[in-house]
């Protein structure tokens, strides 16, 4: 008893081609490209079936349904707008994923998806993976005027990336996308074991405000090359945070300096510190305050610091001073791991060029400087463990 | 981003019946050949599939289980709930909800475990 | 329902390449999927319809699957990828899931 004759479903085609079909003959559907093969909602990797004895298949005719991506993947800090029509995620649909502005800028692509016939959307450099929000660093509500002033009191926006960090000493540091903060190692070295120790603060002026944005820490990474108590040389530090913050006019990461930014770091270039650490009065700032300080020639700061108490190599390659010589405008205990920013005229975009790593005793003594960490140094080692972790 | 999360008893007693939600955010449970799945894990074994629902609402069940598992979604609230009746403690296992998609199943909650005891 | 046989477990040295088998009946006439589980954690999905990876998933992961076996293939393996791993098909609309394999990093 022959068995009915398979009529392919739309879209498929049936194989082999016979005019009838008795017992043990068999025939497969291919769909066309585009189509995949469907029983159900489920994938089939191929379709046979076998004519029986009583006349009838071996198993019910398949669908060849049109390639469905399926509704796109919410993008974090993004949106994602249909292209070729309202909802439609079908084979060659065409969708565009675009970034929240002013905060966020996209990275890997364009964000222009097509459906493939793999059923994924893919974008034009064939990746399947969702592009990325990067935040934009380095915006300020404040603009450089060039002059040398100090002890300011910070407004809402000017230093976004400021981030206060408790949990051992009052130190700071600054937030580099959106989960990781650049700090002193010294800051946090007392929880390189223990991150979950760090309580983390950003968004906020008033040091004492219930008001902020709180973040935790995952891990904490420890520059190799620095030693605990034994001068400060290679004092930097990763935290990394357990989640990503959102980005906002309060809370924004800085910049990592780029190649050329050491042309607008020169000697006598103006560098900002901010912070909540001992004013000269002699107390932690309740307000989030900061410095304009010149960059001082690093002979003359070597110089400075060659002389008892101070051990000889005390200020190395990897550090760069600022201060007035008269004295007066400096970082103090508290300020540590906090960022010693630029502003990049070309790309109107603050970098962060040190961190506040030490000094002397008496902060902002004539002839002494505030020394601070050189972050162009130590570029390939943020990116090598940003990228890693 | 896509996320799913199963909440429910942690304790139930033998006999009676365990009701798990699934609450899904970050994709659409009506559009497309998105399903969601049940599976589950007693301490120390292997997985073991119970249930899946598609936005079609083609439901499929584990043939040993079938009389004792209700599979049913909610669109308006992002939901996917199991029912199972009958608990035994050999059905104590963390039982996780997850993502179907091109048939493989590629989010998946974090787990929820429950245990079945007088 | 179809059983999936996995051996129980796999000892690799770093940077060498760990095979894992899936047997079952005509199993490379359906799509494997295979799953990634670290103890305390949800499985992660590594390899979908035999030999294509999710977005996310290093490239040392590999699969193939034709006869009656499914191999997933981790070349140079790494302390990381010390885990249990399972394999999954669908028998119609039923899924089924593999007995589990123990990769050891030495």
């Known amino acids: 008893q022959p068995c009915p004759y398979p009529m392919a479903p739309p879209n498929g085609h049936v194989s082999p081609v016979q005019a009838k079909y008795i017992l043990k003959d068999s025939f497969s559907i291919f769909c066309e490209t585009g189509y995949e093969l469907l029983q159900g909602h489920l994938p089939l990797k191929s379709f046979t079936a076998v004519c029986q004895k009583d006349g009838s298949w071996d198993r019910p005719m398949p669908a060849c349904s049109i390639v469905d991506c399926g509704p796109p993947d919410d993008l974090p800090s993004g949106r994602v707008e249909y292209i070729t029509g309202p909802g439609v995620t079908t084979y060659k649909a065409v969708i565009q994923y675009s970034c929240e502005e002013t905060f966020y800028t996209m990275k890997v692509n364009d964000g222009k998806y097509v459906c493939e016939a793999d059923g994924f959307w893919t974008s034009s450099k064939g990746e399947k993976s969702l592009p990325v929000c990067e935040p934009v660093c380095g915006l300020s509500a404040r603009t450089t005027g060039g002059r040398i002033y100090g002890g300011q009191k910070a407004k809402p926006g000017d230093f976004p990336w400021q981030v206060l960090i408790l949990g051992g000493t009052t130190a700071a540091g600054a937030l580099l996308y959106d989960n990781w903060v650049l700090t002193a190692a010294h800051a946090v070295y007392e929880q390189k074991h223990d991150a979950s120790a760090l309580d983390i603060r950003m968004g906020t002026l008033k040091r004492l405000s219930p008001h902020y944005t709180q973040a935790w820490s995952e891990a904490v990474f420890i520059h190799e090359g620095y030693t605990h108590d034994a001068g400060f040389d290679n004092d930097i530090a990763l935290i990394k945070l357990n989640n990503k913050v959102v980005i906002n006019s309060n809370i924004t990461p800085i910049c990592l300096p780029r190649k050329e930014a050491e042309s607008f770091m020169r000697t006598d270039d103006i560098g900002t510190a901010s912070g909540w650490g001992l004013t000269q009065r002699g107390f932690l700032a309740r307000n989030l305050m900061y410095v304009d300080i010149p960059i001082v020639d690093h002979q003359k700061c070597t110089a400075a610091y060659e002389k008892p108490p101070y051990p000889r190599g005390s200020v190395t390659a990897n550090m760069l001073c600022a201060g007035l010589e008269s004295g007066g405008k400096d970082s103090c205990r508290g300020d540590s791991g906090g960022a010693l920013v630029f502003l990049d005229s070309e790309t109107e975009r603050w970098f962060v060029g040190g961190i506040v790593s030490w000094g002397s005793m008496n902060c902002g003594e004539a002839g002494q400087y505030g020394v601070y960490t050189k972050v162009i140094n130590y570029i390939p080692w943020i990116e090598n463990i940003i990228s890693d972790f | 981003q896509v996320t799913l999360k199963e909440s429910g008893p942690v304790l139930v007693k033998p006999t009676e019946t365990l009701t798990l939600t699934c609450t899904v955010s970050g994709f659409s449970l009506s559009r497309g050949k998105m399903g969601v799945s049940w599976i589950r894990q007693p301490p120390g074994k292997a997985l073991e599939w119970l249930a899946h629902?598609?936005?079609?609402?083609?439901?499929s069940y584990r043939t040993s289980l079938k009389s004792r598992l209700t599979i049913s979604k909610d669109t308006s609230k992002n939901q996917v709930v199991l029912t199972m009746t009958n608990m035994d403690p050999v059905d104590t296992a963390t039982y996780y909800c997850a993502r179907i998609r091109a048939g493989g199943i590629d989010y998946w909650g974090q787990g929820t475990l429950v245990t079945v005891s007088s | 329902q179809p059983v999936l046989t996995q051996p129980p477990s796999v000892s690799v040295s770093p940077g060498q390449t760990a095979s894992i088998t899936c047997s079952g009946d005509?199993?490379?006439?359906?799509?494997a999927y295979w799953y990634q589980q670290k103890p305390g954690h949800s499985p992660v999905l590594v390899i979908y319809q035999d030999n294509k990876r999710p977005s996310g998933i290093p490239g040392r992961f590999s699969g193939s699957n034709s006869g009656n076996t499914a191999t997933l293939t981790i070349s140079g393996t790494q302390a990381m990828d010390e885990a249990d791993y399972y394999c999954?098909?669908?028998?119609?609309?039923?899924?089924?899931f593999g007995t589990g394999t123990k990769v050891t990093v030495l």
């Open positions: 999954q098909a669908w028998d119609s609309s039923t899924a089924v």
């Open positions: 005509k199993l490379g006439d359906k799509f």
């Open positions: 629902i598609f936005s079609s609402d083609e439901k």
